[in-house]
Amino acid sequence: AQEVQQSPHCTTVPVGASVNITCSTSGGLRGIYLRQLGPQPQDIIYYEDGVVPTTDRRFRGRIDFSGSQDNLTITMHRLQLSDTGTYTCQAITEVNVYGSGTLVLVTEEQSQGWHRCSDAPPRASALPAPPTGSALPDPQTASALPDPPAASALP
């Protein structure tokens, strides 16, 4: 069965920085989406070889692509706090095939220590494949930010 390998699982970046998300498949797909999970999932980009990429207005001018639809690296630039969230690659074959998700934590410079990625993949990756008729894994399971440690208040 077709799979989507997605990396990284999680990345913490300061405001204004860039992040790379790579979506790799074994081929045989028609195109690939990057979608942001949440209570109201957003479609970020659609990429298909030989076709001008389609980009959400919010990210226009902030996204670059390298590679091909089978092995695509998406670079998001000038990240804002509101870009924090879980991003999932979705490959179009005869059915929708999902990547494991990338948790992007965009932080203020001084709060870098509060929210750091663990080695574990985002919780969205533990979900079974969504049933037919379901657009995305349940967004409620893919929380954007972990709770800060209890002693995270500034002195």
Epitope: G31, P41, D43, Y46, T54, D56, I92, E94
Partner: nanobody, 124 residues
Framework: QVQLQESGGGLVQAGGSLRLSCAAS????????MKWFRQAPGKGREFVAG????????SYSDSVKGRFTISRDNAKNTVYLQMNSLKPEDTAVYYC?????????????????WGKGTQVTVSS
């Protein structure tokens, strides 16, 4: 199973506007990429516009770009096609289509469900 019903077609003069609607039955409307196609008399079916699940991605054929706008209201299970500056060559039957595993390009790949169409006639 999804059923699609187009409305809003009619006769309009060149330069005029129309707004087509496509109402979908079923609770999983937001699980579908939606597209509009058209077929002029004696011609093949042609892609017009497409919109992604959330509505944040849209695509258009070169022939309608800047004149037509596709949008959707997931709460109302409806997709729209606002057509401005209509030309006689826009005369066709307009169909909406829905697909769960569909691209944003100008093909009908993955479009599982189709409406019966609504006639748009643009007179000069």
């Amino acid at each position: 199973q999804v059923q699609l019903q187009e409305s809003g077609g009619g006769l309009v003069q060149a330069g005029g506007s129309l707004r087509l609607s496509c109402a979908a039955s079923g609770r999983t409307f937001s699980s579908y990429v939606m597209k509009w196609f058209r077929q002029a008399p004696g011609k093949g079916r042609e892609f017009v516009a497409g919109i992604s699940w959330s509505g944040s991605l849209t695509s258009y054929s070169d022939s309608v770009k800047g004149r037509f706008t596709i949008s959707r209201d997931n709460a109302k299970n409806t997709v729209y096609l606002q057509m401005n500056s209509l030309k006689p060559e826009d005369t066709a039957v307009y169909y909406c289509a829905a697909g769960e595993a569909a691209t944003m390009s100008d093909t009908d790949y993955g479009m599982d469900y189709w409406g019966k169409g609504t006639q748009v006639t643009v007179s000069s």
